[in-house]
């Protein structure tokens, strides 16, 4: 053998995010030598599943046919071919919504702002949390997270955007969280539409604000400036 | 020390149902997949299914996909294994048998203990 | 499925004697291959897995060897306690297959 075998790929379909009761389609695609896929559950001793290859082989479908708290989690994939064992694949971290109730987002003072000024968003819960999770629609890397400090629970996180560019308009959500479990999300609150009208002149966010320009403005991660309003609360950048 | 404990033996009409417990002790239940086997009179082993207990994930030999089916309950450590539409051919002696990793290194699992097997016999 | 054709169906050896067993498989299992012993009451105990490995607390006296699609199994010096049938079984894809059987008696 010449090294050892190169890792699998792991993907969730249609996704890795799943709302209570969907069902989600696991994939390990390994090479055409493999003679069995087996999926392997973060803190669980036994392997996960384990399935026979699909025709050509080169791939195995584990199937959830109705997502539930027990299904969230950290998986990985390997496969077997007449060698030996693959090398694990990288992580799939697959999540649930739909755990707790849908807290509620508003912008303060307006979800209307004008370019160059601040708005704050802000997440509420019903019941206290401690991680809470702001979601931009078509972004390439959409959380950000503000957990809690020494499991201090909180019933809201508030993120500010300032200066605000044309870059941070669109569609928001929210989710709520608990600490114990990171892959149990609560319902997403209801859709913000955050809308930024121009002004003369577009403020050009400072680099320690705003990542490489790169790539486009909706593959940037949101990047909400200033100090954390919450005490207790920390900025977590997924 | 693993022990597999099966429950005793049965005499079924055809048609009917049966359903075959093992209760398992010595060993974290849920740290192993469970097998399930059986032996018709005078012939050789052929396997039927397995479950991980932890999670209840399945897989099944397609010759009894629509007919076996294998639960658990963590709660008393116990497998069970129910054949419907009981035919006469389906006489035969019933195994669980835990299934794990052996040896140090990755990959190596097999079968490595075995409940007494509870004989089921169909007959009109 | 993969098929496992073990012989000899019987045979009768004398205390001492070495025992040979064979085990072919319609395709490449790649050495995930196992032995086990079911004595005459119906318990069933592991002997050897993965072709050559012996399962804890298994008598020495015991050795597998093999690889590809042709398997061994070899008692060294068959004991009156080894009175047994025994069968190969494949674990390389599913679903498990095992071959149909040797039963060893004492002449």
């Known amino acids: 053998q010449a090294g050892p075998l190169p890792k699998p790929t792991l993907w969730a379909e249609p996704g890795s995010v799943i709302s209570w009761g969907n069902s989600v389609t696991i994939w390990c695609q390994g090479t055409l030598e493999a003679r069995e896929y087996r999926l392997d559950k973060e803190e669980s001793p036994a392997p996960w599943d384990r399935q026979n290859p699909l025709e050509p082989k080169n791939k195995a479908r584990f199937s959830i046919p109705s997502m539930t708290e027990d299904y969230a989690g950290r998986y990985r994939c390997y496969y077997r071919s007449p060698v030996g064992w693959s090398q694990p694949s990288d992580p799939l971290e697959l999540v649930m919504t739909g755990a707790y109730s849908k807290p509620t987002l508003s912008a303060l003072p307006s979800p209307l702002v004008t370019s160059g000024k601040s708005v704050t968003l802000l997440c509420q819960s019903r019941s206290p949390m401690d991680t809470f999770l702001l979601i931009k629609e078509r972004a390439a890397h959409p959380l950000l997270h503000l957990r809690s400090e020494h499991g201090a629970q909180q019933h809201q996180a508030e993120f500010p955007m300032s200066p605000v560019t044309s870059v941070h308009g669109g569609t928001y959500r929210c989710f709520s969280s608990h600490g114990f479990s990171h892959y149990l999300l609560s319902h997403p609150s209801d859709p913000l539409e955050l809308i930024v009208s121009g002004s003369l002149e577009d403020p050009r966010p400072s680099p320690t604000r705003s990542v490489s320009t790169a790539a486009g403005p909706e593959d940037q991660p949101l990047m909400p400036t200033g100090s954390v309003p919450h005490s207790g609360l920390r900025r977590h950048w997924e | 020390q693993v022990q597999l404990v099966q429950s005793g033996a049965e005499v079924k009409k055809p048609g009917a149902s049966v359903k075959v417990s093992c209760k398992a002790s010595g060993y974290t239940f849920t740290n192993y997949w469970m097998h399930w086997v059986r032996q018709a009179p005078g012939q050789g082993l052929e396997w039927i299914g397995e479950i991980n207990p932890s999670n209840g994930r399945t897989n099944y030999n397609e010759k009894f996909k629509t007919r076996a089916t294998l639960t658990v309950d963590t709660s008393t450590s116990t497998a069970y294994m129910e054949l419907s539409s009981l035919r006469s051919e389906d006489t035969a002696v019933y195994y669980c048998?835990?299934?794990?990793?052996?040896?140090?290194?990755?990959?190596?699992?097999?079968?490595?203990?075995w409940g007494q097997g509870t004989l089921v016999t169909v007959s009109s | 499925d993969i098929q496992m054709t073990q012989s000899p169906s019987s045979l009768s050896a004398s205390v001492g004697d070495r025992v040979t067993i064979t085990c072919r498989a319609s395709?490449?299992?790649?050495?995930?291959l196992n032995w086990y012993q079911q004595k005459p009451g119906g318990a069933v105990k592991l002997l050897i897995y993965?072709?050559?490995r012996l399962h804890s607390g298994v008598p020495s006296r015991f050795s597998g060897s093999g690889s590809g699609t042709d398997y061994t199994f070899t008692i060294s010096s068959l004991q009156p306690e080894d009175i047994a049938t025994y069968f190969c079984?494949?674990?390389?894809?599913?679903?498990?297959?095992f071959g149909g059987g040797t039963k060893v008696e004492i002449k």
């Open positions: 079984q494949q674990g390389n894809t599913l679903p498990p297959t």
């Open positions: 395709q490449d299992i790649s050495n995930y």
């Open positions: 048998a835990r299934w794990g990793q052996l040896g140090l290194r990755e990959g190596y699992y097999a079968v490595d203990y």
């Open positions: 993965y072709t050559s």
